[in-house]
């Protein structure tokens, strides 16, 4: 005799407002296999019992959360199989506050994820990012849990909000810092991400050709592929529009740290290099994508990276290291720039 | 406090019979699944059999089929196991045990078990 | 029937150590797997049920793992009360049967 339960996983996450149906089936050598559900912790949902088989409907309500079991039984022998459902409600409602940051200063983000279900710590986590890494220097606040306002009876779904005390971000900023959610399931994690834009003040530093003298907010990708580790980043606008870039010195202020070089003759390079005297070494430690990809060649104090064949400026992060000390330098490259040799 | 008390076991001469009870109390005994499970001495666990919450449904070890029947009394909260054609390997401790629908949560409360010693 | 496999049979250990006792399915039973703790003379004690998920009242430094055919019981860090002989138990399919016993005693 064969024994199956469709889908055959033993925990099964569930969306509010969704159905799902289980199947359990028993195949007999001797008559007819009986099967049926038994409610754990449950109130079952609807249950179609036929010759051989039985199917449970969950209807995607908080009270379909809880074990069931099937039973199949044929002759001498029987045979059980639970299934873990876990009804869950994670929509897209994040709510930021501020609306931006303002570079300079001391300030508190926080973050709000609103008609969630379940409202664990161990379920839900919040992670404030500056590309695709968390923000160093960011200290979290205690989390608080609400009830939300229900128009219906029976659906406790709560809102849970998270703050951070950020250190000054400092000048030049980076463009946004992201606040992402992430609801981890059985089998399935589930992550929603809002975009805090970061006010660029007028002192931030500026490419060439660009004339306004005007404050501006600088916006990133919620995607961006790579992520600073620090707080003392260096930025250029990705504001449209989208000037060439001359070669020059894109660097941190701060206590020797390594300085990072764009060359963007014949292709485009950059050097990271280090001037804090003799014994210390530098190299990239992150760029778009996969490191691994791009051409390195690291001497000591200085360190090359580039793309081969010559191509577009990758868009994203790009970090040097030095050592001893680990103090990082960054690079926010846009995409727009292309390497133009022939342009005047 | 959750309780199970076997009783019933003994000395009895190969081809006899016993039958074991097993008084439950401190839960909803009509709502779980019954075992019988054993250990002859200096041997590991053997499931011997189950019957379901409402005595519909009962299960037995290869080695005892035919031979040992599992009831129940809801009325009484008793479990009992009537052994008959008793063969010197039955001789074991006997512990009765529960669980939720039937087996597969696991066997979470024990008796202390009763001896059953077959010997000529 | 299923075929449960328990190894080591035996192990010696100190109070403190990292303790792995493996159980191995002679067919899929999916996470239906128990495990229990017997000292000598007194009945088996529940420890983890459905695989994983640790039975009230017990400590938690005993965990379990695995689904399908292969599973684990960890001991994080082995107390002089943890000598005792532990024991899997598949719950998928009668005739249920258990594994042989792994005898945790003290190096």
């Known amino acids: 005799q064969s024994f199956q339960v469709n889908p055959p996983e033993s925990e099964v996450a569930v969306a509010m407002g969704t159905s799902l149906q289980i199947t359990c089936s028993m195949s007999c050598d001797e008559g007819v296999a009986r099967v049926h559900w038994r409610g754990l912790d449950t109130s079952l949902g609807s249950v179609q019992t036929l010759p051989g088989s039985s199917i449970l409907s969950v209807r995607g309500m908080l009270s379909d959360t809880g074990t069931p079991v099937c039973v199949g039984s044929c002759g001498s022998r029987s045979f059980q199989h639970s299934v873990k459902i876990l009804v869950y409600a994670f929509p897209d409602q994040l709510v930021v506050s501020p609306e931006f940051l303002v570079p300079g200063q001391d300030q508190v983000v926080s973050c709000t994820a609103h008609n969630i279900w379940p409202a664990d710590p161990n379920s839900l986590s919040f992670a404030l990012l500056l590309g695709e890494q968390r923000l160093e220097g960011a200290q979290a606040l205690e989390p608080e849990q609400e009830e939300e306002i229900q128009e219906a009876e029976g659906t406790p779904l709560f809102r849970m909000t998270q703050r951070w005390r950020l250190p000054s971000l400092g000048t030049p900023a980076p463009p946004a810092l992201h606040c992402q959610v992430t609801m981890q399931l059985p089998k399935l994690v589930l992550t929603h991400r809002k975009e805090i834009p970061v006010l660029q003040s007028q002192t931030s530093p500026k490419p060439p050709n660009t004339t306004s003298a005007e404050p501006y907010i600088l916006t990133s990708s919620s995607t961006a592929e790579a992520v600073s580790t620090g707080l003392n980043i260096t930025t250029l606008p990705s504001a449209p529009p989208y000037p060439k870039l001359s070669p020059r010195t894109l660097s941190s202020e701060g206590p020797c740290r390594p300085k990072i070089h764009q060359d963007l003759e014949a292709g485009w390079e950059l050097l990271c290099e280090a001037s804090c005297g003799p014994g210390v070494t530098v190299r990239w430690t992150l760029a778009p994508g996969d490191l691994a990809t791009y051409h390195k060649r690291e001497a000591g104090a200085q360190a090359w990276l580039s793309v081969l064949p010559p191509g577009p400026m990758v868009e994203g992060w790009f970090q040097c290291r030095q050592d001893p000390g680990g103090e990082v330098t960054n690079l926010y490259v846009p995409g727009q720039v292309t390497p133009n040799s022939s342009s005047t | 406090e959750v309780q199970l008390l076997e009783s019933g076991g003994g000395l009895v001469q190969p081809g006899g019979s016993l039958r074991l009870s097993c008084a439950a109390s401190?839960?909803?005994?009509?709502?779980?699944?019954m075992h019988w499970v054993r250990q002859a001495p200096g041997k590991g666990l053997e499931w011997v059999a189950v019957?379901?919450?409402?005595?519909?449904?009962?299960y037995y070890a290869d080695s005892v089929k035919g031979r040992f029947t599992i009831s129940r009394d809801n009325s009484k909260n008793t479990l009992y196991l009537q052994m008959n054609s008793l063969r010197a390997e039955d001789t074991a401790v006997y512990y009765c045990?529960?669980?939720?629908?039937?087996?597969?949560?696991?066997?979470?409360?024990w008796g202390q078990g009763t001896t059953v010693t077959v010997s000529s | 029937d299923i075929q449960m496999t328990q190894s080591p049979s035996s192990l010696s250990a100190s109070v403190g150590d990292r303790v792995t006792i493996t159980c191995q399915a002679s067919?899929?039973?999916?996470?239906?797997l128990n495990w229990y703790q017997q000292k000598p003379g007194k009945a088996p004690k529940l420890l983890i049920y459905?695989?994983?998920s640790l039975q009230s009242g017990v400590p938690s430094r005993f965990s379990g793992s695995g689904s399908g055919t292969d599973f684990t019981l960890t001991i994080s860090s082995l107390q002089p009360e943890d000598f005792a002989t532990y024991y899997c138990?598949?719950?998928?399919?009668?005739?249920?049967?258990f594994g042989g016993g792994t005898k945790v005693e003290i190096k």
């Open positions: 019957i379901s919450d409402d005595g519909s449904d009962k």
């Open positions: 401190g839960f909803t005994f009509s709502s779980y699944g």
């Open positions: 459905a695989a994983s």
């Open positions: 045990t529960t669980s939720k629908y039937y087996y597969y949560y696991g066997m979470d409360v």
């Open positions: 067919q899929d039973i999916s996470k239906s």
């Open positions: 138990q598949q719950g998928y399919s009668t005739p249920l049967t």
